[in-house]
C-alpha cells in the first residue's frame, strides 16, 4: 500500500504539472494574441498599402506539431522585425516594434525552452509575411485545442 508521504509527493507532482500546463496555456494564448494583433494591423495597413510588405520572403517549417518547432518561428523574428521597421508609417504604427518582437521572442523561449540545439527544417517554399503569421496562428490554435484543460 502506498505510504502517506508517497501519496503527498505524487499529489504535489500532479499539482506542479497542472501548474506548468496552465502556464504553458497562458504563454500560448499570449503568443496567439500577439501574432493575431500583428496580422490584424498588417491586414488593415491602409488595406492595400500591404503589397509593399508582401515583397519579403518568410520561411515556414516543413512540419510543426510540437512546441520545440517554435524554434522555426524564433529564427524568423529578425526578418519580421525588419519588415515592421520598414513599414512604419502614419497608417501603420507599432509604438515599439523592437519591444513587440522582443516580447514574442521571450514567450517563444518560455514555450520551447532555451535549448537551441534543435535545428529547424524549413520548407522549400517561402511565404509572404501574411501567410507566415497565419501559419503560426494556426499552430498556436492547434496546440491550444489539443492541450489538456
Amino acid at each position: 500500500a502506498p505510504t502517506s508521504s508517497s501519496t503527498s509527493s505524487s499529489t504535489a507532482e500532479a499539482q506542479q504539472q497542472q501548474q506548468q500546463q496552465q502556464q504553458q496555456q497562458q504563454h500560448l494564448e499570449q503568443l496567439l494574441m500577439d501574432l493575431q494583433e500583428l496580422l490584424s494591423r498588417m491586414e488593415n495597413y491602409r488595406n492595400l498599402k500591404l503589397p509593399r510588405m508582401l515583397t519579403f520572403k518568410f520561411y515556414l517549417p516543413k512540419q510543426a506539431t510540437e512546441l520545440k518547432d517554435l524554434q522555426c518561428l524564433e529564427d524568423e523574428l529578425g526578418p519580421l522585425r525588419h519588415v515592421l521597421d520598414l513599414t512604419q508609417s502614419k497608417s501603420f504604427q507599432l509604438e515599439d516594434a523592437e519591444n513587440f518582437i522582443s516580447n514574442i521572442r521571450v514567450t517563444v523561449v518560455k514555450l520551447k525552452g532555451s535549448d537551441n540545439t534543435f535545428e529547424c527544417q524549413f520548407d522549400d517554399e517561402s511565404a509572404t509575411v501574411v501567410d507566415f503569421l497565419r501559419r503560426w496562428i494556426a499552430f498556436c490554435q492547434s496546440i491550444i485545442s489539443t492541450s489538456p484543460q
Partner: antibody, heavy 117, light 108 residues
Framework: EVQLVQSGTEVKKAGDSLKISCKGS????????IGWVRQMPGRGLEWMGT????????RYSPSFQGQVTMSADKSISTAYLQWGSLRASDTAMYYC??????????WGQGTMVTVSS | SYELTQPPSVSVSPGQTARITCSGD??????AYWYQQKSGQAPVLVIY???KRPSGIPERFSGSSSGTTVTLTISDVQAEDDADYYC??????????FGAGTKLTVLG
C-alpha cells in the same frame, strides 16, 4: 475591364516642361500603388518610382529623385509624371503600371517621349 | 546600388525547355517577379512571388528559387514565347529593381 490608359506620344525640345498621364479604370484606383517605368530605345526596364493615389505617398528610385515629379488626382483616377526641363537623354518609352500582390500586374500601353536637342 | 544579374540571351528550339536565371544578394529574403515583353508591346507579368502564375498565363511557365538565384522555366517552348524576359525584385530598402533582361530566341 481593369486597364490603364496613357496619354499620347510627345515630341519636345530640350528645356521644355512636360506632364504625361495614366488613367485607371475598372478598379478602385485610390488603393493601388501606381509605378512608373522607363525604357530607353533598345534598352531594358528601369523602375522610376511609385505613388499611392489615396494620399499621394511617393517613393522615388535614387536614380530619378529630383529629376521627375509624380503626382495623382484620385478624383479623376489619374496619375501623372512630369519634368520641369527635358533633356535629350529623357527620350524613352514611359510605362505606368498597377502594383498588386507586390507585382506590376496591369500595364499601360506606354507613352513615347522624344526630346530633340 | 542593388543589381539583378541575368544572361543577355538564351536560344532554344521549339518544344525544348528554356531556363532563364536571375541572381541578386537580396533574393533569399525578397520575392522575384518575371515579365515578358514582346517587340513593340508593354511588359506582361508571367510569374510573381517566385513561383506563382497569374491567371491567363500558360502552365508551361514556372518559377523556382534557390538561395540568391531565381529561375524562370518555359517548357515546350513555342514560337510565340520569343521575347525579352525581365526579373524584378526589391532591394533591402524597398526600392524596386529590374534585371537587364534576357532575349529568348526561339530557333527555326
Amino acid at each position: 475591364e481593369v486597364q490603364l490608359v496613357q496619354s499620347g506620344t510627345e515630341v519636345k525640345k530640350a528645356g521644355d516642361s512636360l506632364k504625361i498621364s495614366c488613367k485607371g479604370s475598372g478598379y478602385n484606383f485610390d488603393t493601388y500603388w501606381i509605378g512608373w517605368v522607363r525604357q530607353m530605345p533598345g534598352r531594358g526596364l528601369e523602375w522610376m518610382g511609385t505613388i499611392y493615389p489615396a494620399d499621394s505617398d511617393t517613393r522615388y528610385s535614387p536614380s530619378f529623385q529630383g529629376q521627375v515629379t509624380m503626382s495623382a488626382d484620385k478624383s479623376i483616377s489619374t496619375a501623372y509624371l512630369q519634368w520641369g526641363s527635358l533633356r535629350a537623354s529623357d527620350t524613352a518609352m514611359y510605362y505606368c503600371a498597377r502594383f498588386s500582390s507586390s507585382a506590376y500586374d496591369i500595364w499601360g500601353q506606354g507613352t513615347m517621349v522624344t526630346v530633340s536637342s | 546600388s542593388y543589381e539583378l544579374t541575368q544572361p543577355p540571351s538564351v536560344s532554344v528550339s521549339p518544344g525544348q525547355t528554356a531556363r532563364i536565371t536571375c541572381s541578386g544578394d537580396a533574393l533569399p529574403r525578397k520575392f522575384a517577379y518575371w515579365y515578358q515583353q514582346k517587340s513593340g508591346q508593354a511588359p506582361v507579368l508571367v510569374i510573381y512571388q517566385d513561383t506563382k502564375r497569374p491567371s491567363g498565363i500558360p502552365e508551361r511557365f514556372s518559377g523556382s528559387s534557390s538561395g540568391t538565384t531565381v529561375t524562370l522555366t518555359i517548357s515546350d517552348v513555342q514560337a510565340e514565347d520569343d521575347a525579352d524576359y525581365y526579373c524584378q525584385s526589391a532591394d533591402r530598402s524597398d526600392s524596386y529593381v529590374f534585371g537587364a533582361g534576357t532575349k529568348l530566341t526561339v530557333l527555326g
